[in-house]
Interface confidence: low
């Protein structure tokens, strides 16, 4: 009969740096042997060879040595391709061409994505502001893909579209840094929010700045930090923003600045006696010395770890003193789930199978949802376990026990509740008797 080659209709979405499975399956006839199989993966547009299997053996990767087949599953009709350490340049269409006696092919799209960082906000000018002044607010978010959508709104949620200039620049890896500039005339006070949206991940990164133009009473130190937690990806750098209002004639010799852990009061970083006293926190913190005199007491925390999560207090003393606490929320995206099936061959309607969905190295703990091919949630007979590794990152394993119908698709969605990042995997079980063509 005709050789049917099946691939997912929807693009496979993969985070930069993770591994992706480009699913492809065919229907082997009875008596099929791998010696008969010619399998070619190639780039759809250029026909560049990516990986092949011929003459009964894996001919290996022709694509930067980052591809692999699933040799143990080929005989069952699983021609899927594993692409490791995904890069932006990998984005596009891959064709799976299978030839036995008949031949067939199908193309699967790879959509590459990378989450945007929590935006940083800067203000120019940033002191002695009065109602009626024009200020430039810059919102910067880094290392995302594809290009972001940027939205500004005021404190009432009203969109601000006039006087906005947004630029996006790709680095050598193809990841975008986005800088959006809003020019606005100050009222008595105001909050300005910037939202950077990754259109593929449907990930929104928010920041806001509240500007209160009126001057502080003489001597009082107003310390301001963001209301919302600062969200930082594991391994990246985070800025814990803190600002105060220096009086005219203020000198750094007057300043005592202490950053400490809110709960334990453990010292993190300090500035006193006119100089930076350095990091007391694993040598991973730094101030912005050139900005201190302007009232910027922000702290840079490098190479963020899960253990850094929590509340940090910024304490400023000049003549008077003031303090405020900012929360650091650490996050790490979950990997594309891998799906396994037990048993995985000679399946018949009425059989009970165990489908395991595994996703790795995320933080915080994931929410896991199962649904069938119609999108109906499956809640019975689901067991989900999450185990933290030594870095505090979670591996999640969710097991669904299900009685097979005539055919069925079972989808697993692993959600990072902080990043609002959803990683999907699905498996389609068809035929009678059925085999297992996984559709990751």
């Amino acid at each position: 009969g005709a050789l049917e080659v099946q691939v997912p209709e929807d693009p496979v979405v993969a985070l930069v740096g993770t591994d992706a499975t480009l699913c492809c399956s065919f229907s082997p006839e009875p008596g099929f042997s791998l010696a008969q199989l010619n399998l070619i993966w190639q780039l759809t547009d250029t026909k560049q060879l990516v990986h092949s299997f011929a003459e009964g053996q894996d001919q290996g990767s022709a694509y930067a040595n980052r591809t692999a087949l699933f040799p143990d599953l080929l005989a069952q009709g699983n021609a899927s391709l594993r692409l490791q350490r995904v890069r932006v340049a990998d984005e596009g269409s891959f064709t799976c061409f299978v030839s036995i006696r008949d031949f067939g092919s199908a193309a699967v799209s790879l959509q590459v994505a990378a989450p945007y960082s929590k935006p940083s906000m800067t203000l120019e000018p940033n002191k002695d502001l009065r109602p009626g002044d024009t200020v430039t607010i810059t919102c910067s978010s880094y290392q995302g893909y594809p290009e972001a959508e940027v939205f500004w709104q005021d404190g009432q949620g009203v969109p601000l579209t006039g006087n906005v200039t947004t630029s996006q620049m790709a680095n050598e890896q193809g990841l975008f840094d986005v800088h959006s500039i809003l020019r606005v005339v100050l009222g008595a006070n105001g909050t300005y929010s910037c939202l950077v949206r990754n259109p593929v991940l449907q990930q929104d990164a928010h920041s806001s700045v509240t500007i209160t133009p009126q001057r502080s009473p003489t001597g009082a130190v107003e310390v301001q930090v963001p209301e919302d937690p600062v969200v930082a990806l594991v391994g990246t750098d985070a800025t814990l923003r803190c600002s105060f209002s220096p009086e005219p004639g203020f000198s750094l010799a007057q300043l005592n600045l202490i950053w400490q852990l809110t709960d334990t009061k453990q010292l993190v970083h300090s500035f006193t006696e006119g100089r930076d006293q350095g990091s007391a926190y694993a040598n991973r913190t730094a101030l912005f010395p050139d900005l201190l005199a302007q009232g910027n007491a922000s702290l840079r925390l490098q190479r963020v770890r899960v253990a850094d999560e929590g509340s940090f207090t910024c304490f400023v003393s000049i003549r008077d003193f003031g303090s405020a606490a900012v929360s650091l929320q650490v996050a790490a995206p979950y990997s594309k789930p891998s799906m396994t099936l037990e048993p995985n061959k000679d399946l018949r309607p009425g059989d009970t199978v165990t489908i395991t969905c595994s996703s790795y190295r995320g933080y915080p703990e994931a929410e896991v949802f199962w649904q069938d091919g119609q999108g109906v949630p499956l809640t019975g007979n689901v067991t989900t376990s999450q185990m933290a590794n030594e870095q505090g990152l979670f591996d999640v394993h969710s097991v669904l026990r299900v009685v097979l119908g005539a055919n069925g698709t079972y989808s697993c969605l692993v959600r990072n509740p902080v990043l609002q990042q959803d990683a999907h995997g699905s498996v389609t079980i068809t035929g009678q008797p059925m085999t297992f063509p996984p559709e990751a």
Partner: antibody, heavy 119, light 108 residues
Framework: EVQLVESGGGLVQPGGSLRLSCAAS????????MSWVRQAPGKGLELVAA????????YYADSVKGRFTISRDNAKNTLYLQMSSLRAEDTAVYYC????????????WGQGTLVTVSS | DIQMTQSPSSLSASVGDRVTITCRAS??????LAWYQQKPGKAPKLLIY???NLQSGVPSRFSGSGSGTDYTLTISSLQPEDFATYYC??????????FGQGTKLEIK
């Protein structure tokens, strides 16, 4: 810009039939599930029927099951609601809505079309 | 089907007031809940999705919270344009995803 425009409403006698249409534009219609929501005069909202993106799965409120049929033509970017054996209690404004992704609510609604069942 | 019970069914309040509307599901809906605002003669407008996420373009005075079976819509400081009818709707399980019966918010 996402737009949903309903048509086909009007006055019909009890026991009669009517077909509502919803013309969709501004988005990839074939990628989204769709629903019909109705609102009787002075009453609340009721989701009467829903259909998935390829039309393979349909769902109905108990109050209309067996009498109403939801369907779609992805080539024409159009959603339909075939209503038969109409009753006085089916009198309502009928809204066409787009089903957003998981947990995201009904963000886009048409302006509504009024169906009046009366002798 | 899951039943959604909204309370109160009507409410009188003044501009500047803080207002809370609650919605109770007949079973756990796992935060799969949306809130809508509807003004006379108009289609409903989505305010909150996934129990607590503010829909783009909706003023920040609106907020949602809750989990399990109990959910709340809060308007922190009522504005004149907020007088309307509010509905909750669950998105758990198969359609039809039922609405609450509505809460009419009137000027005191």
């Amino acid at each position: 810009e996402v737009q949903l425009v309903e048509s086909g409403g009007g006055l019909v006698q009890p026991g009669g039939s009517l077909r509502l249409s919803c013309a969709a534009s501004g988005f990839t219609f074939s990628s989204y599930g769709m629903s019909w929501v109705r609102q009787a005069p002075g009453k609340g909202l009721e989701l009467v029927a829903a259909i998935n993106s390829n039309g393979g799965s349909t769902y109905y409120a108990d109050s209309v099951k067996g009498r109403f049929t939801i369907s779609r033509d992805n080539a024409k970017n159009t959603l339909y609601l075939q209503m038969s054996s109409l009753r006085a209690e089916d009198t309502a404004v009928y809204y066409c809505t787009r089903n957003e992704e998981f947990r995201r609510g009904l963000a886009y609604w048409g302006q509504g079309t009024l169906v009046t069942v009366s002798s | 089907d899951i039943q959604m019970t909204q309370s109160p069914s009507s409410l009188s309040a003044s501009v500047g007031d803080r207002v809370t509307i609650t919605c109770r599901a007949s079973e756990n809906i796992y935060s799969n809940l949306a809130w809508y605002q509807q003004k006379p003669g108009k289609a409903p407008k989505l305010l909150i999705y996934a129990a607590s996420n503010l829909q783009s373009g909706v003023p920040s005075r609106f907020s949602g919270s809750g989990s399990g079976t109990d959910y709340t819509l809060t308007i922190s400081s009522l504005q004149p344009e907020d007088f309307a009818t509010y509905y909750c709707q669950h998105f758990w399980g198969t359609p039809p995803w039922t609405f609450g019966q509505g809460t009419k918010l009137e000027i005191k």
